[in-house]
Interface confidence: medium
């Protein structure tokens, strides 16, 4: 969901109250407060659906809940893409879609979500203890990955308990740096607020004379995110046959969607909202990375600091690939 938060303009303090230093110390807390409030953690959700008609066929759907623009999506199986997983599909908003068997059809559903149909046959059916992972590379958040596993289960539809923190790869120097600054800023803000606790509060009102205040991009967490308190770790457990409605979804919706945990099964907000589809679990892995494309199996040319492109030298193209033009 994309929202915008407006930083309120500050009425200058009365002369003699705190002087120039006072003005700085009053502006800073509000700027930092805005940053702290608007720096929402992005999330990746994963849904795994088993086709009722074809029990060895699965649909994986993934979405990104964040305010950044998505530059690449990688779907892999067997674990996260850089840690033993192998790529099933790579979707680039401009460069096209690449997919590998047994992926049958990968496509964009919205600007921030994708779906992938996976066909299994006999021994290679994806039921065989397979973990599916979706990684979204976005700017400025970096790479976020969530995974859901499909172990064989004799109890279809029952949700697996959240798994203890499996991976959080913190090699995202730039973004972690920003996070560090924000964290420091928030701590400093608390310190300033404590210092100003016993002082008269400054009068805050929108400035009528000054130009519009700077606008900060913000990500407003969905109800589900707030309800789940950002517990990011849950495995998606399905079996090789459709689950029954009552065991799978006390909240309703199609019975074959594996959406866990149930406490997070609210409707998604914004672009990821589909009719009668509960919001899925946070994946069983969440990872943050900097080499946005490197982990997707691309080895792009060096294109300047922090900018990586697919190795197509001819510039941006329309969505093309084996599945046709979007």
């Amino acid at each position: 969901m994309r929202t915008e938060a407006q930083v309120p303009a500050l009425q200058p303090p009365e002369p003699g109250l705190e002087g120039a230093m006072g003005h700085r110390t009053l502006v800073l807390p509000w700027v930092l407060l805005t940053l702290c409030v608007t720096a929402g953690t992005p999330e990746v959700w994963v849904q795994v659906r088993m086709e009722a008609t074809e029990l060895s066929s699965f649909t994986i759907r993934c979405g990104f809940l964040g305010s950044g623009s998505i530059s690449l999506v990688t779907v892999s199986w067997g674990g996260p893409n850089g840690a033993g997983g192998t790529t099933l599909a790579v979707l680039h908003p401009e460069r096209g879609i690449r997919q590998w068997a047994p992926a049958r059809q990968a496509r964009w559903e919205t600007q921030s979500s994708i779906s992938l149909i996976l066909e299994g046959s006999g021994a290679s059916s994806p039921c065989a203890n397979t973990t599916f992972c979706c990684k979204f590379a976005s700017f400025p958040e970096g790479s976020w990955e969530a995974c859901g596993s499909l172990p064989p289960s004799s109890d279809p539809g029952l949700s697996a308990p959240p798994t203890p923190a499996p991976i959080l790869r913190a090699d995202l120097a730039g973004i972690l740096g920003v996070s560090g600054v924000l964290l420091f800023g928030c701590v400093y803000l608390l310190h300033l607020l404590r210092r100003h606790k016993h002082r008269p509060a400054p009068r805050l009102q929108p400035s009528r004379t000054s130009p519009q205040a700077p606008r900060a991009r913000a990500w407003a967490p969905s109800q589900a995110s707030q309800a789940a308190l950002h517990v990011p770790y849950a495995t998606i457990n399905t079996s090789c046959r459709p689950a029954t409605l009552d065991t799978a979804h006390p909240h309703g919706g199609p019975s074959w969607w594996a959406s866990l945990p149930t406490h997070a099964a609210h409707r998604p907000q914004g672009p990821a909202a589909w009719a009668s589809t509960p919001i899925p679990a946070r994946g069983s892995f969440v990872s943050v990375e900097n080499g946005l494309y490197a982990q997707a199996g691309e080895r792009p040319p060096h294109t300047g600091p922090g900018l990586t492109l697919f190795p197509d030298p001819r510039g941006p193209r329309a969505m093309e690939g084996p599945l046709g033009v979007r």
């Epitope: 047994p102 992926a103 197509d312």
Partner: antibody, heavy 120, light 107 residues
Framework: EVQLQQSGPEPVKPGASVKISCKAS????????IHWVRQSHGKSLEWIGY????????GYNQKFKSKATLTVDSSSSTAYMELRSLTSEDSAVYYC?????????????WGQGTSVTVSS | DIQMTQSPASLSASVGETVTITCRAS??????LAWYQQKQGKSPQLLVY???TLAEGVPSRFSGSGSGTQFSLKINSLQPEDFGSYYC?????????FGGGTKLETK
């Protein structure tokens, strides 16, 4: 040294099945996909499918989906391809080859090939 | 499936000459193309991947170029060991397909 050692030549009768092996050494078996490629006498190469040793997941060329079954035994770093309902059309040299998981390096090492001859 | 069309099917050349083999994809495969060399009775060997990156140990007289649907493999100053068959293969996604091959023979 990376090596893919394939099983020996297989003379088989029409309608029978055959299982050929590809033993990998010199690298971490689960870090690479194993692909299978067919080459009929004097012809080009045809991709049959691949298997991902990490979890045994396989992907097939539709043309070979009912003909070939790919499996792995990670404990012995060996990949297998079973060919069934063989006909004279299936007489060919079958190669295994490895490819880095992210599939952008090409098939960099190949087995020596297994010749399958179907004749009554 | 993506079709790969290679030309010429056969080619005669002498040691020291420069030859070019071309490969055309039936649809855009960006730079996801590999070239292989195969000598009589031997397994194929990777020469080039991602259209222009030389595989490890491949002599610099080999070079790949192209993107989209048109690709070529150029061999400068042919050496005796370069004679054999050459195949292009897309790695844009499965099913992988190979070109029909180019047989490079001595003149």
């Amino acid at each position: 040294e990376v090596q893919l050692q394939q099983s020996g030549p297989e003379p088989v009768k029409p309608g029978a099945s055959v299982k050929i092996s590809c033993k990998a050494s010199g690298y971490t078996f689960t870090d690479y996909n194993i692909h299978w490629v067919r080459q009929s006498h004097g012809k080009s190469l045809e991709w049959i499918g691949y298997i991902y040793p990490y979890n045994g997941g396989a992907g097939y060329n539709q043309k070979f989906k009912s003909k070939a079954t790919l499996t792995v035994d990670s404990s012995s770093s060996t990949a297998y391809m079973e060919l069934r309902s063989l006909t004279s059309e299936d007489s060919a040299v079958y190669y295994c080859a490895r490819e880095e998981l992210r599939r952008d390096y090409g098939m960099d090492y190949w087995g020596q090939g297994t010749s399958v001859t179907v004749s009554s | 499936d993506i079709q790969m069309t290679q030309s010429p099917a056969s080619l005669s050349a002498s040691v020291g000459e420069t030859v070019t083999i071309t490969c055309r994809a039936s649809e855009n495969i960006y730079s996801y193309l590999a070239w292989y060399q195969q000598k009589q009775g031997k397994s194929p060997q990777l020469l080039v991947y991602n259209a222009k990156t030389l595989a490890e140990g491949v002599p610099s007289r080999f070079s790949g170029s192209g993107s989209g649907t048109q690709f070529s493999l150029k061999i400068n100053s042919l050496q005796p060991e370069d004679f054999g068959s050459y195949y292009c293969q897309h790695h844009y996604g499965t099913p992988y397909t190979f070109g029909g091959g180019t047989k490079l023979e001595t003149k």
